[in-house]
């Protein structure tokens, strides 16, 4: 858990941080795990430690090894270990396995491929980028912060990725590359007429008076994000904002849920403090979208309390 | 949503031992350090200590120290703070609290609702 | 142990009036500060971390800063609901230590 998997090029930046985290303004110390011998703080030095990030500028080969941080908080100490690879420049354009990122998947609708690592170096736009070594040209590809977005994707645009940016340190430029599969997905969303799936058509809730109660609308419109979906819960026909009882309120905000791939909202009703009079209401659960509204309708019912005999 | 439920109040008598608890639910237990306080009106809030669930490893007020045994229970998500040799100076509300150490907020960022223990003969 | 000197101990004030604590370090705790409010019957909550960071949903009107011993949250419009006791803390250092407490009452 505590243990973490780092690599690069020789000659490239490359900057680790540690697997065990703490605040800012915690204390970390690094080690060279092999020797123990402290890596020095000094931007002088090409390998140097800054804070929670240890940096190789620029890697070499002979770096490769494990490194131990240390997070040091007023009351713990927190042991991390870095697994550094470095590796020698391929000659060809293969980008070996051992040097890829994890892959990413893409659709029509969402094409975003990130740049790894990014986030930990000091660098400024823009991002070259490389499909299996060619340089990305074309109104298509726009590399846009720290990933690139694919216009109308297809299925041939599946492929290795590669970003390349300079990172920037006192005034020193230092190059990085870093490889990750893109994998294409077929997306074909739908949208159909509303499936209500929560609570049945006529169903009675039982309730206690003076308790509070929830009652979940919940509905299915297709597959995929749909273009105008809602759900929401009426009171004898009327919605529940001008029904004017602060006791009924509807939870704020819709969730949004993908069960089995199909693009679900619910909408609870939260009734505080039962009184008699809610018995008499009618509670309609409405699903709306593009082909229509299906309502179901809940009535409740008094629950008799349990006796318990000895 | 991130709750801590602590145990009930209680009354226990000088010299004896107290056993509090505290239920953590809605968080991943073991990434947060769980923290004690304890609250009198006259001294305020005072700091008991902290666990850190993923190891067990506690670091303890001097003040305290000897006296409160912090532990906890990945399996229940459940911390516990033992006091021993209880003298009416121990008669307080006592929370727990998850300290957020590796993202913001860091700090205190949940409490549990306390626990009252009074000491009397 | 850091001591945390918390001043005023009692704020009278009136809706609408700016409020300011001090809490004063008895050495340097950076910037890990924190505030704490609690109301009558309630546990403390966090209002304000890394001496000027405002947590999550609390209202803009509350606001801390300061850095090294000397540090200062202010309530900008103070309202009815801000009536509570107010806490520093430094997580700088172990033993964690806490001031002694501000109590706000609103005339």
């Known amino acids: 858990k505590f243990s973490k998997q780092s690599w690069g090029l020789e000659n490239e930046a490359l900057i680790v941080r540690c697997p065990r985290q703490g605040k800012p303004s915690y204390t970390v110390d690094w080690y060279y795990s092999q020797t123990n011998k402290s890596i020095p703080t000094q931007e002088r030095n090409r390998v140097f430690a800054s804070g929670q990030l240890l940096k190789f500028l620029p890697a070499a080969v002979a770096d490769s090894g494990i490194y131990t941080c240390i997070v040091r908080s007023p009351t713990f100490n927190r042991t991390g270990y870095a697994n550094v690879t470095i590796y020698k420049k391929q000659s060809d354009c293969n980008v070996p396995d051992y040097l890829m990122y994890s892959t990413v998947s893409g659709s029509e609708k969402n094409s975003k491929i990130y740049c790894p690592t990014i986030d930990l170096y000091n660098w400024t736009a823009p991002l070259e980028w490389f499909k299996n070594c060619q340089a990305l040209q074309g109104s298509r590809y726009r590399a846009h912060k720290s990933f690139l977005v694919i216009d109308n994707v297809m299925t041939e645009d599946a492929g290795d990725y590669t970003c390349k940016f300079i990172h920037n340190e006192n005034g020193a430029n230092y190059s990085v590359t870093a490889t990750r599969s893109f994998t294409v997905k077929d997306e074909q969303g739908f949208s159909l007429f509303p499936v209500i799936g929560a609570p049945a058509q006529n169903e009675i809730k039982e309730v206690e008076i003076g308790k509070n109660a929830n009652l979940t609308c919940s509905a299915c419109f297709g597959k995929g994000t749909q273009f105008l979906a809602a759900v929401l819960w009426q009171l004898n026909g009327t919605k529940i904002t001008d029904f004017g009882e602060p006791r009924i309120q509807q939870e704020e905000g819709q969730n949004q849920s993908f069960s089995n791939g199909l693009a679900c909202l619910d909408m609870v009703l939260r009734i505080a403090d039962v009184k008699e009079e809610d018995l008499l209401l009618q509670y309609d659960c409405l699903a709306l979208n593009l082909h229509g509204l299906r309502r179901h309708t809940v009535r409740l019912s008094r629950k008799n309390p349990i006796d318990h005999h000895s | 949503q991130v709750q801590l439920q602590q145990s009930g109040a209680e009354l226990v008598r000088p010299g004896a031992s107290v056993t509090l608890s505290c239920k953590a639910s809605?968080?991943?237990?073991?990434?947060?350090?769980m923290h004690w306080v304890k609250q009198t009106p006259v001294h305020g809030l005072d700091w008991i200590g902290t666990?850190?669930?993923?190891?067990?490893?506690?670091a303890y007020n001097q003040k305290f120290k000897g006296r409160a045994t912090l532990t906890a229970d990945k399996s229940s998500s459940t911390a516990y703070m033992e006091l021993s040799s209880l003298t009416s100076e121990d008669s307080a509300v006592y929370y727990c609290?998850?300290?957020?150490?590796?993202?913001?907020?860091?700090?205190?960022?949940?409490w549990g609702q306390g626990t009252s223990v009074t000491v009397s003969s | 142990d850091v001591v945390m000197t918390q001043t005023p101990k009692f704020l009278l004030v009136s809706a609408g009036d700016r409020v300011t604590i001090t809490c004063k370090a008895s050495?340097?705790?950076?910037?890990?500060v924190a505030w704490y409010q609690q109301k009558p019957g309630q546990s403390p909550k966090l209002l304000i971390y890394?001496?000027?960071n405002r947590y999550t949903g609390v209202p803009d009107r509350f606001t801390g800063s300061g850095y090294g011993t000397d540090f200062t949250f202010t309530i900008n419009t103070v309202q009815a609901e801000d009536l509570a006791v107010y806490f520093c803390?430094?997580?700088?250092?172990?033993?964690?230590?806490f001031g002694g407490g501000t109590k706000l009452e609103i005339k």
């Open positions: 609290t998850r300290y957020s150490y590796t993202n913001s907020p860091y700090g205190m960022d949940y």
């Open positions: 809605g968080y991943t237990f073991t990434d947060y350090e």
């Open positions: 666990i850190d669930p993923e190891t067990g490893d506690t």
């Open positions: 050495q340097s705790v950076s910037n890990d």
């Open positions: 890394y001496a000027s």
């Open positions: 803390q430094q997580d700088y250092s172990s033993p964690y230590t």
